[in-house]
Interface confidence: low
Amino acid sequence: KELKVTQPEKSVSVAAGDSTVLNCTLTSLLPVGPIRWYRGVGPSRLLIYSFAGEYVPRIRNVSDTTKRNNMDFSIRISNVTPADAGIYYCVKFQKGSSEPDTEIQSGGGTEVYVLAKPSPPEVSGPADRGIPDQKVNFTCKSHGFSPRNITLKWFKDGQELHPLETTVNPSGKNVSYNISSTVRVVLNSMDVNSKVICEVAHITLDRSPLRGIANLSNFIRVSPTVKVTQQSPTSMNQVNLTCRAERFYPEDLQLIWLENGNVSRNDTPKNLTKNTDGTYNYTSLFLVNSSAHREDVVFTCQVKHDQQPAITRNHTVLGFAHSSDQGSMQTFPDNNATHNWN
């Protein structure tokens, strides 16, 4: 009977960590000589298994090749890794007496595709916080997957975003691949509670994509709106000033009261009010004894937010000498307001 080496599968796909069988059958046991499995072709081909009774980690024969009539030379590879990818050839040799064994026929080859899962996507953003209306880039990276075909999508609050660029490397054939994608997001003041999600779908994930998440709270700065107001006096000798910092993020806030440019009080906010959009409010009260101030005084509320330049709001209160009516009060618009002490 004519010898034919048959590898019925042109390719097999196996998940990393699983096992796979590479089938090889012969139509004849003649001529006498060994069967060997190789990965690759040519001088650099790698001997994988030779049915010589040797112990090879992770590889064993499927059938009992010591049986005289055995024609099945299939092997099982266990705990497959991406490095096992390649084309495997079942090769029949004719035994030499003095000279080396001679290769007489090879199977058509079975390509092993290792299905390796992508790593959990890692989303990175800008090193510095951005402000509303600023465009910032986020990058998503995942690596170690095979085969090469993969889908990556970006979402912000459920809406799909179009990436600036997505690349899968290397472009040629490899045991495993990496993907990198960049998306541009326009920040807005409502984004403190928002998330940017990178979603990766791959054959190995069984329709359950992996997600990487960037909380925009880590990448946005919303500067406060600062207002200074004067409350109705509680007594004839007391003025109540209020400095209100509204809708800011992150929490880092320092508030200083100045009288005519001199620091009067440092206020370290402790109990911030949180808004539903994730931003914060803070109100600082400054009680001033009017009897100590006969001249005009400029009160300044200075707010430093998240290491940014200070925001200042002035409030002028007229001294007693300017007042013709006890307790009368004038308020001026814009940042500067002028009031009577009593």
Partner: antibody, heavy 119, light 107 residues
Framework: QVQLQESGPGLVKPSQTLSLTCTVS??????????WSWIRQHPGKGLEWIGA???????YYNPSLKSRVTISVDTSKNQFSLKLSSVTAADTAVYYC???????????WGQGTTVTVSS | DIQMTQSPSSLSASVGDRVTITCQAS??????LNWYQQKPGKAPKLLIY???NIEDGVPSRFSGSGSGTDFTFTISSLQPEDIATYYC?????????FGGGTKVEIK
């Protein structure tokens, strides 16, 4: 033995969307290990690869057509589909679907369906 | 995109002749090349995959060789039923691209 059969309208008006379906028989589209591709051939011309889909979702398109092409798969019906929007007379061609192993070529083809774009 | 340049674009040969078609890739594609036969009014048929492997059921007079950028397809003894157009196709890089085709006729 896997067989493929294209179906869809033979005549499409300019600016409309061309829609074709490829039905797979003799095997499961979701068995894995294959690309399911669309190829077209303009009258008297060569072959042009449109794109391919893997059953689980990843899709590749020819960049020259990407803005107008959508390929999708319906594993429950064992079918995959092609949509080509904003067609012109230049999209008149025979459209083929094929099964393609990772490294074993497009070994199974549909018989092809002729699509004419004309008003 | 990888450009596949096939030559000649057409040829005429006698029954029994040896016919050779070449395909040149614009970049190294290793052995990621297939050859197809297309008869008039029919779908293409895979003949050779991975540059040199003959598809099951394909007559042994068809063969392929080459690697890198230069590939050859050979019909060792042309038969009347071989009248067709032959295409090479690379799949090393997306998008997959085909050669322009070689039309083979009988003298």
């Amino acid at each position: 033995q896997v067989q493929l059969q294209e179906s869809g309208p033979g005549l499409v008006k300019p600016s409309q969307t061309l829609s074709l379906t490829c039905t797979v028989s003799g095997g499961s589209i979701s068995s894995g290990g294959y690309y399911w591709s669309w190829i077209r051939q303009h009258p008297g011309k060569g072959l042009e690869w449109i794109g391919a889909i893997y059953y689980s979702g990843p899709i590749y398109y020819n960049p020259s057509l990407k803005s107008r092409v959508t390929i999708s798969v319906d594993t429950s019906k064992n079918q995959f589909s092609l949509k080509l929007s904003s067609v012109t007379a230049a999209d008149t061609a025979v459209y083929y679907c094929s099964k393609e192993g990772y490294h074993s070529g497009m070994d199974v083809w549909g018989q092809g369906t002729t699509v004419t774009v004309s008003s | 995109d990888i450009q596949m340049t096939q030559s000649p674009s057409s040829l005429s040969a006698s029954v029994g002749d040896r016919v050779t078609i070449t395909c040149q890739a614009s970049d190294d594609i290793s052995d990621y090349l297939n050859w197809y036969q297309q008869k008039p009014g029919k779908a293409p048929k895979l003949l050779i995959y991975d540059a040199s492997n003959i598809e099951d059921g394909v007559p042994s007079r068809f063969s392929g060789s080459g690697s890198g950028t230069d590939f050859t397809f050979t019909i060792s003894s042309l038969q009347p039923e071989d009248i067709a157009t032959y295409y090479c196709q690379q799949f090393a890089y997306l998008p997959w691209t085909f050669g322009g085709g070689t039309k083979v006729e009988i003298k």
